[in-house]
């Protein structure tokens, strides 16, 4: 399916609006520091060029690859060297090396100011004055902060963002209408970004075999009535879509995602009974709906797996004939029977089964060797079950904030070398698993919890890769994707760590504490808690609880005082001295 002009092909397939949006996202994800106006200029130039190619596919440069066209355009930015330093060296390379170079310079933690939400009236005025610019700005600001955000999904978020303003700026109480919608979009957006980051890490660090295995497991849980061949086709297509998006090929990715949605809706009968309501929606909504669709009901008459995968004399023959197909079928069969298992657990079981076959199929009597393989799965299943049970009990006992604090202490003791902001961010997100998953029925708890934890721990891995400080983190992050969570769970107090010297400045607070939002106050307190553990890694829970209770009391007292700053100045050193004594 070759086209004389790739850019014309994509422009025609996607339409001008989506084409421009995706090019803006692509450029913003590559050049994260460039001002908005610069990106808009580049996008307009690319769009005008695409239109000339639509008019005449033989026109000059229309036959060039998208990487060549986009890379050439990015390399025209005048301040590339001053703003991006060595990324400018990418421009000396030829494709495909140039694009690989740009990808390697994507920054997961760009030094950008946090987005401040203006007053509702200010936002509504901006929306009405220039809707197109307002929405472009949204795409730009999200994309530059989340350089791996799933681009076609970001277009869906932008459509919802637009709908929220269109509705709420007409409402009697604009703020009451708009703010909850914006909060929801922000939270969903962060979650979507983190989930996509794991997909890209899986593809880039562990290869497409790892991603395909994940997809087989997940789609088999979602579509247990679909045949293996159907699931395999969806997995192949989905892998192509995500490979393209993770590789910066956003136009191809969005186009292929639309094709996949079309295929699924045309073949609902052989996929899932749950797709119907998705398929009536417009494209962006339809693709989102299909990605989030609930699991179909399991067929009632599924036979035992043992017959084909343990009792059969042909196990080793089938394995030898097509290892990946046989293991894929095992994973499909196991996953469709177990919507109650996390995808990561299913992948561990498939890995264990593969290891058993590798060992046993080399034996003179393989069956004698692998007869008890399913019994070996029991500890693998029980480990996450127990972990979820224990942590949900702790969450219910403590509530979210204190549960986060327990995790902060736990993870700081495991990997005290990691930066305090990273430990706070990751532990706060790990702690959100409680509210997200513990309220669910038993059968949904493990898939919710463990697969969410995998997403959060990937964030730790991604941030740590940028600035590696801990061999333990590197080991857990790189050895095995499916065993990352158990690897981190198994880490104990780092005995080799030399405690951080006490720095009074770290524990000095001012009256500005009192004007912070509840969330910001929590982050301040949790930052102090991490620093405390880094200073005294062997402090007991009771000691830390005592210090944190004193801290809360001290802040509350000073925030009620008439002269807040004077109170902080006087009470602060007392709190520090008392804390040091309590931890001595």
């Amino acid at each position: 399916d070759t086209h004389k002009s790739e850019v014309a092909h994509r422009f025609k397939d996607l339409g001008e609006e989506h084409f421009k949006g995706l090019v803006l996202v692509a450029f913003s994800q590559y050049l994260q520091q460039c001002p908005f106006e610069e990106h808009v200029k580049l996008v307009n130039e690319v769009t005008e060029f695409a239109k000339t190619c639509v008019a005449d596919e033989s026109a000059e440069n229309c036959d060039k690859s998208l990487h060549t066209l986009f890379g050439d355009k990015l390399c025209t930015v005048a301040t590339l060297r001053e703003t991006y330093g060595e990324m400018a060296d990418c421009c000396a390379k030829q494709e495909p090396e140039r694009n690989e170079c740009f990808l390697q310079h994507k920054d997961d933690n760009p030094n950008l100011p946090p987005l401040v939400r203006p007053e509702v009236d200010v936002m509504c005025t901006a929306f009405h004055d220039n809707e197109a610019t307002f929405l472009k700005k949204y795409l730009y600001e999200v994309a530059r902060r989340h350089p791996y955000f799933y681009a076609p999904e970001l277009l869906f978020f932008a459509a919802r963002y637009k709908a929220a303003f269109a509705e709420c700026c007409q409402a009697a109480d604009k703020a009451a209408c708009l703010l909850p919608k914006l909060d929801e979009l922000r939270d969903e957006g962060k979650a979507s970004s983190a989930k996509q980051r794991l997909k890209c890490a899986s593809l880039q660090k562990f290869g497409d075999r790892a991603f395909k295995a994940w997809a087989v497991a997940r789609l088999s849980q979602k579509f247990p009535k679909a045949e293996f061949a159907e699931v395999s086709k969806l997995v192949t297509d989905l892998t192509k879509v995500h490979t393209e998006c993770c590789h910066g090929d956003l136009l191809e990715c969005a186009d292929d995602r639309a094709d996949l949605a079309k295929y699924m809706c045309e073949n609902q009968d052989s996929i899932s009974s749950k797709l119907k309501e998705c398929c009536d929606k417009p494209l962006l909504e339809k693709s989102h709906c299909l990605a989030e669709v609930e699991n179909d009901e399991m067929p009632a008459d599924l036979p035992s797996l043992a017959a084909d995968y343990v009792e059969s004399k042909d196990v080793c023959k089938n394995y030898a004939e097509a290892k990946d197909v046989f293991l894929g079928m095992f994973l499909y069969e196991y996953a469709r029977r177990h919507p109650d298992y996390s995808v990561m657990l299913l992948l561990r079981l498939a890995k264990a089964y593969e290891a058993t076959l590798e060992k046993c199929c080399a034996a003179a009597d393989p069956h004698e060797c692998y007869a008890k393989v399913f019994d070996e799965f029991q500890p693998l299943v029980e480990e996450p079950q127990n972990l979820v049970k224990q942590n949900c009990e702790l969450f219910e006992q403590l509530g979210e904030y204190k549960f986060q604090n327990a995790l902060l202490v736990r993870y700081t003791k495991k990997v005290p070398q990691v930066s305090t902001p990273t430990l706070v961010e990751v532990s706060r997100n790990l702690g959100k698993v409680g509210a997200k998953c513990c309220k669910l029925p038993e059968a949904k708890r493990m898939p919710c919890a463990e697969d969410y934890l995998s997403v959060v721990l990937n964030r730790l891995c991604v941030l740590h890769e940028k600035t590696p400080v801990s061999e333990k983190v590197t080991k857990c992050c790189t050895e095995s994707l499916v065993n990352r969570r158990p690897c981190f769970s198994a880490l104990e107090l780092d005995e080799a760590y030399v405690p951080k010297a006490f720095n009074a400045e770290t524990f000095t607070f001012h009256a500005d504490m009192c004007t912070l939002s509840e969330k910001e106050k929590q982050v301040k307190k949790q930052t102090a808690l991490v620093e405390l553990v880094k200073h005294k890694p062997k402090a007991t829970k009771e000691q830390l609880k005592g210090v944190m209770d004193n801290f809360a009391a001290f802040v509350e007292k000073c925030c009620k005082a008439d002269d807040k700053e004077a109170c902080f100045a006087e009470e602060g050193p007392k709190f520090v001295a008392a804390s040091q004594a309590a931890l001595a």
């Epitope: 042909d314 023959k317 590798e358 199929c361 003179a364």
Partner: nanobody, 115 residues
Framework: QVQLQESGGGLVQPGGSLTLSCAAS????????MSWVRQAPGKGPEWVSA????????RYADSVKGRFTISRDNAKKTLYLQMNSLKPEDTAVYYC????????GSQGTQVTVSS
């Protein structure tokens, strides 16, 4: 694609000897245990002998113990069955398989023991 090609069969008198070979391709031969299976006219398949991937562990059906020897050469991707003191009841089509499978994935080689 897995391919197993047996050879070495033929007509032999009772008490005679034959050596069967099985040339393997399309899979990592050196990683798999292998077996010889036979099927006499009008009967079901019967497992004869097995060997592990390294050649260290060998197993035999009671009916052939002491008379047949299984071996392998991983470098040549070949499995062997040395058959001595052959009897008329050894008459069958012999085929090699992966693991302990008794599914016939090849033509096999005919062994006839008759005076």
């Amino acid at each position: 694609q897995v391919q197993l090609q047996e050879s070495g069969g033929g007509l032999v008198q009772p008490g005679g000897s034959l050596t069967l070979s099985c040339a393997a391709s399309g899979f990592t031969f050196g990683s798999f245990g292998m077996s010889w299976v036979r099927q006499a006219p009008g009967k079901g398949p019967e497992w004869v002998s097995a060997i592990d991937s390294s050649g260290a562990d060998t197993r035999y059906a009671d009916s052939v113990k002491g008379r047949f020897t299984i071996s392998r050469d991983n470098a040549k991707k070949t499995l062997y069955l040395q058959m001595n003191s052959l009897k008329p009841e050894d008459t069958a089509v012999y085929y090699c398989t992966i693991g302990r499978s008794t599914s016939r994935g090849s033509q096999g080689t005919q062994v006839t023991v008759s005076s």
